[in-house]
């Protein structure tokens, strides 16, 4: 069974996404798995379905259970399951392990803590951040978009960080909190202008029509963990996600490697079932950090 765990606190908003993918135009039906009873789509209900999302506004402990989502896609309907657990609010400060999202690590050069699941909600900045239940105050802490930046990180900054924000639904406000652990790595390092190791500038890559092809964008940015370093691909100057060709996808998540002690990032561009029209596109490998941006261009040619 294709299922996903989700959790939340009573009297807070919880929004869950169907674990099966679908285009925005696809209808998604939600059901209580135990009773097979359909979940309403009318927003006046406390629990209602909204396309790929299931909304608990607010959640109650009794909402815990398995929910079925069926994506009404062409050819076959795709079924997913959301395993939802709603917990009672803790009276003390301790956040139990079962409420914790994945741990993140940081260093003096890189101290971003993302607020988990926030992309599912309709929220407005700024986020409130707490460490071990204490509101974070002082110029070292900066709430930026959906993450917290800590300047001059020290080992004492390790701990449990909670983000708190307000979800707005049709004029009504609901509180949401999410907690994750932050660990600090002691690291001496430096950053420099990005150096792209691959591909070479104006490289011609030979591909076979009808086969799959991979292009790797690889760049190094300095020594140690880097703050705001990224590599990505563009097609004809457009982000891959905006280009709209589903056969051409970036590999999710950037692979981090250390070459001769340098911090390097790879991003693989996967082209499924190469077509003639792919040969007409310009493929740009972009590497950027605080120092600036470097671009190497690749073109495809048909293998003889």
């Amino acid at each position: 069974k294709f299922s996903k765990q989700s959790w939340g606190l009573e009297n807070e908003a919880l929004i869950v996404r169907c674990p099966r993918q679908g285009k925005p135009s696809y209808t998604v039906d939600w059901y209580y798995s135990q009773t097979n009873k359909s979940i309403p789509t009318q927003e006046r209900n406390r629990v209602f379905a909204s396309g790929q999302l299931l909304k608990f506004l607010p959640a109650e402990v009794a909402d815990s259970g398995i929910y079925t989502c069926i994506v009404r896609s062409p050819t076959f309907n795709r079924t997913g399951y959301a395993n939802v657990t709603i917990y009672k609010k803790q009276s003390d400060c301790n956040v139990p392990d079962y409420l914790m999202y994945s741990t993140v690590s940081g260093s003096e050069k890189n101290s971003k803590i993302y607020c988990p699941t926030i992309d599912l909600y309709n929220w407005t900045a700024p986020l409130e951040w707490f460490k071990n239940c204490q509101a974070l105050q002082g110029s070292r802490y900066r709430a930026h978009k959906s993450f917290l930046v800590i300047d001059n990180v020290m080992t004492e900054d390790a701990g449990d960080y909670t983000c708190k924000f307000i979800h707005n639904e049709n004029g009504a406000n609901y509180s949401v909190t999410a907690t994750r652990s932050f660990t600090v790595k002691d690291e001496q390092g430096f950053s420099l202008f990005p150096v792209i190791g691959a591909p070479a500038q104006n490289e011609i890559k030979e591909v076979e029509i009808g086969k799959n092809a991979n292009l790797t964008c690889s760049a190094c940015f300095g020594k140690g963990t880097q703050f705001l370093a990224a590599v990505l691909w563009q097609l004809n100057g457009t982000k891959i996600t905006d280009f709209g060709e589903p056969r051409i996808q970036q590999e999710e998540g950037q692979n981090q490697s250390f070459s001769n002690g340098l911090a390097c990032l790879d991003m693989v561009l996967r082209i499924a079932d190469v077509k003639e029209e792919d040969l007409l596109l310009q493929y740009d490998c972009l590497a950027l950090n605080l120092h600036g941006l470097r671009r190497h261009t690749v073109r495809l040619s048909r293998k003889n």
Partner: antibody, heavy 121, light 111 residues
């Protein structure tokens, strides 16, 4: 080269069982739905089973309960277990590549050469 | 189940001349994403079928531009602008909106 190679066909008596295999190569197998389509001699094409990227399975009523499709992504393989076979199941069985990544549809763009199943006493 | 009906059953053609095959579905194949889930396949003698057209009008990779697909909803047409001797075989339409069902096929042969 993108290809699908079927095996496991043969002669079997009515009520018997057979397991067909399909070995895929040249593409990211785990990202695609896979189907089996059959064709009786001199007849048209009939879809007999499908399996999606997460292993959910789909069948027409004509084979439901008798045929089971499965996949082994680590081996780039898809299988069709056929039980309680009937004379009407006699056909060439094709392994076919289908939908990419749950919802990107490019047609059934790769077909194997087929393997022949004969059910008779 | 969606039923697919093709016509004609048999189509004698002259090389260099155009040819047209019709396919009708028992319900609309136009989905909410704006696509018609209708494909065309050609099975040449002694070979496996291969894809010609997907989603009503998109030519598959490597398919010559003399093949074109058109139509929407329940009525679809495959056109060959100038038939070549290599185009002989059985042409099938297939719907992919609700599971998969094929038309009965149209046999194209040289006059």
């Amino acid at each position: 080269e993108v290809q699908l190679v079927e095996s496991g066909g043969g002669w079997v008596q009515p009520g018997g069982s057979l397991r067909l295999s399909c070995a895929a190569s040249g593409f990211t197998f785990s990202s695609y739905d896979m189907y089996w389509v059959r064709q009786a001699t001199g007849k048209g094409l009939e879809w007999v089973s499908g399996i999606d990227t997460v292993g959910d399975t789909y069948y027409p009523d004509s084979v439901k309960g008798r045929f089971t499709i499965s996949r082994e992504n680590a081996k780039n393989s898809v299988y069709l277990q056929m039980n309680t076979l009937r004379a009407g199941d006699t056909a060439v069985y094709y392994c076919v590549r289908g939908i990419y990544g749950d919802f990107y549809y490019y047609g059934l763009d790769v077909w194997g050469h087929g393997t022949t199943v004969t059910v008779s006493s | 189940d969606i039923v697919m009906t093709q016509s004609p059953l048999s189509l004698p053609v002259t090389p260099g001349e155009p040819a047209s095959i019709s396919c009708r579905s028992s319900q609309s194949l136009l989905y909410s994403d704006g696509n018609n889930y209708l494909d065309w396949y050609l099975q040449k003698p002694g070979q496996s079928p291969h894809l010609l057209i997907y989603l009503g009008s998109n030519r598959a990779s490597g398919v010559p531009d003399r093949f074109s697909g058109s139509g929407s909803g329940t009525d679809f047409t495959l056109k060959i602008s100038r038939v070549e001797a290599d185009d002989v075989g059985v042409y099938y339409c297939m719907q992919a909106l609700q599971t998969l069902t094929f038309g009965g096929g149209t046999k194209v042969e040289i006059k």
